[in-house]
Amino acid sequence: CDLPQTHSLGHRRTMMLLAQMRRISLFSCLKDRHDFRFPQEEFDGNQFQKAEAISVLHEVIQQTFNLFSTKDSSVAWDERLLDKLYTELYQQLNDLEACVMQEVWVGGTPLMNEDSILAVRKYFQRITLYLTEKKYSPCAWEVVRAEIMRSFSSSRNLQERLRRKE
């Protein structure tokens, strides 16, 4: 399955939107910094079957969508930018969804990389617990916004490697 060029553009637009969403300086939130232990190894490996890699990317975007779809999120961010973010993420999910399904039917059901999916889920669990702990403060959301940008940057690299494999 070839990810459409629009997927790359959508990814870039998502990064831009996340940057635009910034409401306060990260420097004023230094005391709230946190290591969420991004599972970098799940994005570095060349050991991935293509279907597995696409599933991992899908999980990152799906969890990001869910994170920013909460009531607490709608209070924290500019509604207009949030709506644009939802649209971008939704489109990317659709692109990846079609690819996952195509990979499934081309080669029978490939083995789901369970540990990679779980690693991504745990990473977002750490983010969720951090926000809860910090009572969804503006600084906590700013730290999370910056972290999600970092994770999208890493997933972009995985997408580029996928494209080179095609």
């Epitope: 969890q63 869910n66 399904m101 059901t109 889920r121 745990k122 669990q125 969720t128 617990l129």
Partner: antibody, heavy 119, light 108 residues
Framework: QVQLVQSGAEVKKPGASVKVSCKAS????????MHWVRQAPGQGLEWMGE????????IYNENFKSRVTMTRDTSTSTVYMELSSLRSEDTAVYYC????????????WGQGTLVTVSS | EIVLTQSPATLSLSPGERATLSCSAG???????LYWYQQKPGQAPRLLIY???NLASGIPARFSGSGSGTDFTLTISSLEPEDFAVYYC?????????FGQGTKLEIK
């Protein structure tokens, strides 16, 4: 509000298959993995596996891998769990439970479907 | 597979008393992925505590959770009549996800 409504009780003969449904409402169906958990009479809970309704990929408990199939129908926001080669030990209440994170993990359950396997 | 062993299997106490339920894991479980559920006869399980020590929405403050590594505890500070039920610990730290066999809390 989030609701998971399961299909009714079933009685099956050993060797047959059963297909239990779980209809979701009150949230975006494709955004959350759906899990299946079973409970034999007077026993504890046993996780069977999960399905991502968005693309249909599944992760199964090895104990059920050869006999279980989880599918979904996005047009009706319904997930299905089919268990084949039934034996008497499969007599249990089967629950669907929605995934999520933090306080949302297994925060929503179906009402349960009793499957009785008897000759 | 991470085996969760709950003790005691049955706990007989009176309303107003303090209940301490244990959950022991066969191998280490990150506290973020250890949950507790309550189940009453004929009902689906209900989330009580998430990530070892956080109260789920609508759960009274008499419930609390603690622990780390392989030993986790659910405490009910002063039992109310509606607390008599079966309690399960659950982990999703690694596949396959598992539950303890349950502790039945009954009225003495």
């Amino acid at each position: 509000q989030v609701q998971l409504v399961q299909s009714g009780a079933e009685v099956k003969k050993p060797g047959a298959s059963v297909k239990v449904s779980c209809k979701a409402s009150g949230y975006t169906f494709t955004n959350y993995w759906m899990h299946w958990v079973r409970q034999a009479p007077g026993q504890g809970l046993e996780w069977m596996g999960e399905i991502n309704p968005s693309h249909g990929r599944t992760i199964y408990n090895e104990n059920f891998k050869s006999r279980v199939t989880m599918t979904r129908d996005t047009s009706t926001s319904t997930v299905y769990m089919e268990l084949s080669s039934l034996r008497s030990e499969d007599t249990a209440v089967y629950y669907c439970a929605r995934g999520g994170l933090g306080p949302a993990w297994f925060a929503y359950w179906g009402q349960g479907t009793l499957v009785t396997v008897s000759s | 597979e991470i085996v969760l062993t709950q003790s005691p299997a049955t706990l007989s106490l009176s309303p107003g008393e303090r209940a301490t339920l244990s959950c022991s894991a066969g191998s280490s479980v990150d506290s973020s992925y250890l949950y507790w559920y309550q189940q009453k006869p004929g009902q689906a399980p209900r989330l009580l505590i998430y990530s070892t020590s956080n109260l789920a929405s609508g759960i009274p403050a008499r419930f609390s959770g603690s622990g780390s590594g392989t030993d986790f505890t659910l405490t009910i500070s002063s039992l109310e009549p509606e607390d008599f039920a079966v309690y399960y610990c659950h982990q999703w730290s690694s596949y396959p996800f598992t539950f303890g066999q349950g502790t039945k809390l009954e009225i003495k």
